[in-house]
């Protein structure tokens, strides 16, 4: 009748069949259930009997196969850090926490633990777009060709400059990164006074 | 031929410390989990301490954790136990003994005994 | 922590006779008991594990039985050299449990 075939089974080699869903147990030398996800061990296995697991408490979880014998406290996001909730802990999961908007993570320890605000892009300048938002700070890329922005943002993106005759309108000076086209009434002279402003 | 010499027991007092050793010969002692076992005059067996091949591991019965640990010199296939804050109650006869190392887990060798006195 | 309980204690017996000693578990322990003979002044020497099975060495008149939590040694006939002290231990969960030990003496 030895070994077994479902745990606990004896192991002379310290591994498991199973190691997601299994550990070995050296005080007895055998391989032992994990608990799952949501759970805990609330009675150690031995020999004669295979881990007990209890669900874990309210505000507190375990998310892989484990074999710990207490939950992990749930944690809220911490404001302080700049950080906000974008999922609430469950059994089996902790509290999912984002960087607030306009903010980037500074500090990383398997998640972050503190966002700071992102730097502020130049006018002729954008921020790079990321593949996930609030992974790092600003990097400020130039407008490209036909576009302009004319702020100190760290979210503000180049716009396409304005086509003065998809409105009936002349070109008075071109578009720059850091500014839009001026625009003019074909009909009417630019004053002076008046570079740098669309006429109607 | 397996076998297991204990020697180091004595008259201590009260509070006091003493280390026993256990002379492994006969067999790969690095494959074997190691125990202490100890016998009160004219009682039964108790369980005293265990450590796993490598020394690792070790553990031990309520009645003698934080007091009493167990180590192993492979090197040199000898068993330790050093026993601390001695009490009355620890006089006994201290045997090693080997656990099989299948999967029945008995004990299949024990060595001749070292008694250990505790008296004031 | 498991209780072993042994029976009896102590016990009279001739030579040629058969003897039973009993040790009952405080719940199954799934075969994980070792029976062990113990002479005055010497190591308890094993001889049945896994409540069935004869050790190496040992005499054939020396038997093993049981399941759960109810296991028996048997010696089917007495011998001058098996007067002695006898254990039960369980191994199937920690803090492993010796019986109180039973103590055959010649009738």
């Known amino acids: 009748s030895q070994p077994q075939a479902v745990p606990p089974y004896a192991s002379e080699n310290q591994t498991c069949r199973d190691q997601e869903k299994e550990y070995y147990e050296p005080q007895h030398r055998i391989c032992c259930s994990r608990c799952p996800p949501g759970t805990y061990v609330s009675a150690k296995c031995s020999r004669i009997r295979d881990t007990v697991c209890a669900t874990c408490a309210e505000n507190s979880y375990n998310e892989h196969w484990n074999y710990l014998t207490i939950c992990q406290l749930c944690r809220p996001c911490d404001p302080v850090m700049g950080l906000e909730e974008i999922a609430p802990c469950t059994s089996k999961r902790k509290t999912q926490c984002r960087c607030q908007p306009g903010m980037f993570c500074a500090a990383w320890a398997l998640e972050c633990t503190h966002c700071e605000l992102l730097s502020d892009c130049p006018p002729g300048t954008e921020a790079e777009l990321k593949d996930e938002v609030g992974k790092g700070n600003n990097h400020c890329v130039p407008c490209k060709a036909g576009h302009f922005q004319n702020t100190s943002s760290p979210s503000a993106r180049c716009q396409p400059h304005t086509r003065c005759e998809n409105q009936g309108l002349v070109e008075a000076a071109p578009g720059t990164a850091q500014s839009d086209t001026t625009c003019k009434n074909p009909l009417e002279p630019l004053p002076p006074e008046m570079s740098g402003t669309m006429l109607m | 031929e397996v076998q297991l010499v204990e020697s180091g027991g004595g008259l201590v007092k009260p509070g006091g410390s003493l280390r026993l050793s256990c002379a492994a010969s006969?067999?790969?002692?690095?494959?074997?989990?190691m125990y202490w076992v100890r016998q009160a005059p004219g009682k039964g067996l108790e369980w005293v301490a265990t450590?796993?091949?490598?020394?690792?591991?070790?553990y031990y019965p309520d009645s003698v954790k934080g007091r009493f640990t167990i180590s192993r010199d492979n090197a040199k296939n000898s068993l330790y136990l050093q026993m601390s804050s001695l009490r009355a109650e620890d006089t006994a006869v201290y045997y090693c003994?080997?656990?099989?190392?299948?999967?029945?887990?008995?004990?299949?060798?024990w060595g001749q005994g070292t008694t250990v006195t505790v008296s004031s | 922590d498991i209780q072993m309980t042994q029976s009896p204690s102590s016990l009279s017996a001739s030579v040629g006779d058969r003897v039973t000693i009993t040790c009952k578990a405080g719940?199954?322990?799934?075969?994980?008991l070792s029976w062990y003979q113990q002479k005055p002044g010497k190591a308890p020497k094993l001889l049945i594990y896994?409540?069935?099975r004869l050790a190496d060495g040992v005499p054939s008149r020396f038997s093993g039985s049981g399941s759960g939590t109810d296991y028996t040694l048997t010696i089917s006939s007495l011998q001058p050299e098996d007067f002695a002290t006898y254990y039960c231990?369980?191994?199937?969960?920690?803090?492993?449990?010796f019986g109180g030990g039973t103590k055959l003496e010649i009738k």
């Open positions: 896994y409540a069935t």
């Open positions: 006969g067999f790969t002692f690095s494959d074997y989990y």
């Open positions: 231990l369980q191994h199937g969960e920690s803090p492993w449990t």
């Open positions: 003994a080997r656990e099989e190392n299948g999967n029945f887990y008995y004990f299949d060798y």
């Open positions: 450590i796993s091949d490598g020394g690792s591991y070790t």
């Open positions: 719940q199954d322990i799934k075969s994980y």
